[in-house]
């Protein structure tokens, strides 16, 4: 109960919660988040833990078709949407069961993609034309990442890779790149 999903025509999955989870954060940027200066002990709060691994977050299954113009994958693909706040693992199930998200008073723990898997997808086109197969990268697991007071707004944007970071209010877009113009990390774009 509370985690049934409805697939609409756009193949989005809408969790049925007492209150809607926050939209999934942008993707993780390992380079930014792994810097030593982004560390530091979080402010004390009642559920403080020593290890982020003690926190968990919800992995919502998301089923959709891969499309390229009028062409669509023969079968839908399933990946995960990393959704909502993170809380201590021992508290999260009960909190979710009541349709409430546990919100820490100290640091903000965000639920973000952790591992990806690649999948080759065969597309089908109307009229029988034969398109090429495509490779997609799908979120395979989620993890909690701690945001401390050291993360200002511009640093928060770096949770998204350069490939997925919006610029000037525009939607996310891939980074132009060449061997002589290697700029930002693309690895986690999906």
């Amino acid at each position: 109960q509370g985690w049934q999903a409805f697939k609409n025509d756009a193949t989005e999955i809408i969790p049925e919660l007492g209150e809607y989870p926050e939209p999934p954060p942008e993707l993780e940027n390992n380079k930014t988040m792994n810097r030593a200066e982004n560390g530091g002990r979080p402010p004390h709060h009642p559920f403080e833990t020593k290890d982020v691994s003690e926190y968990s977050c919800r992995e919502l299954h998301f089923t959709r078709y891969v499309t390229d113009g009028p062409c669509r994958s023969a079968k839908p693909v399933t990946e995960l949407v990393c959704s909502g706040q993170c809380g201590p693992a021992r508290l999260l199930p009960n909190a979710i069961g009541r349709g409430k998200w546990w919100r820490p008073s100290g640091p903000d723990f965000r639920c973000i993609p952790d591992r990806y898997r690649a999948q080759r997808v065969q597309l089908l086109c109307p009229g029988g034309e034969a398109p090429r197969a495509r490779k997609v990268r799908l979120v395979a697991s989620c993890k909690c990442k701690r945001l401390t007071r050291f993360h200002n707004q511009s640093e928060l944007k770096d949770f998204g890779t350069e490939a997925a970071r919006p610029q000037k209010g525009r939607k996310p877009r891939p980074r132009a790149r060449s061997a002589k113009a290697n700029q930002a990390e693309l690895e986690n774009a999906y």
Partner: antibody
């Protein structure tokens, strides 16, 4: 830093064999299609073929089918382009490129990462 | 094979002028991608999926079109924009590039 690093320039004689490489850095090539593109001196870009390093499946442009072989070793994240018998007309710059992907409600593919290019000169 | 024909082959313009590059496909394609190449460099992505500006690319670049006719527009040429531009289709094998348009300083 995500990049494709290609092997150095080659000078060969007609009839010789050659294998050039393209190594993925900070990403696994098995997760992407890796493409090879030829650019003859003063000319445009020509797509040669692609490989899925996960299982070695390849596709070639008709004009390059049987002329070159594309292969990969996913354990070292490296793709290869090879010739068994070079011709003077193979003189060109060869680029490898990664076909990137992301999804934001629509699916997008594009050549996002390019190698620096390998110059191959075939002359007697 | 989908043939992409770019025109003009060469465009001679001055900095500050507007550049309009055309790419025509021999049969309908879903999307066109545009790349810029400068001498001695690898190509780099400018516009993907017909009209989406790649990150890090200035807003003076824009793309449009559908079906068989596509356009890359540079609203006001900067000195660094003088280069060769290629269109590409990724939907059908064999993948193909246009022959390129060289934008040179008048």
């Amino acid at each position: 830093e995500v990049q494709l690093v290609q092997s150095g320039a080659e000078v060969k004689k007609p009839g010789e064999s050659l294998k050039i490489s393209c190594k993925g850095s900070d990403f696994e090539i098995k997760d992407y299609y890796i493409h090879w593109v030829r650019q003859m001196p003063g000319k445009g870009l020509e797509w040669m073929g692609q490989i899925d390093a996960e299982d070695g499946e390849t596709e070639y442009a008709p004009r390059f089918q049987g002329q070159v072989t594309i292969s990969a070793d996913k354990s070292i994240s490296t793709a290869y382009l090879q010739w068994s018998s070079l011709k003077a007309s193979d003189t060109a710059m060869y680029y490898c490129a990664r076909e990137g992907y992301y999804y934001d409600g629509r699916d997008y593919w594009y050549f996002d990462v390019w190698g620096q290019g390998t110059t191959v000169t075939v002359s007697s | 094979e989908i043939v992409l024909t770019q025109s003009p082959a060469t465009l001679s313009l001055s900095p500050g002028e507007r550049a309009t590059l055309s790419c025509s496909a021999s049969s309908s394609v879903s999307y066109i991608h545009w790349y810029q190449q400068k001498p001695g460099q690898a190509p780099r992505l400018l516009i993907y999926s017909t009209s989406e500006l790649a990150s890090g690319i200035p807003a003076r670049f824009s793309g449009s079109g559908s079906g068989t006719d596509f356009t890359l527009t540079i609203s006001s040429l900067e000195p660094e924009d003088f280069a060769v531009y290629y269109c590409q289709q990724l939907s059908h094998l064999p993948l193909t590039f246009g022959g390129g348009t060289k934008v040179e300083i008048k």
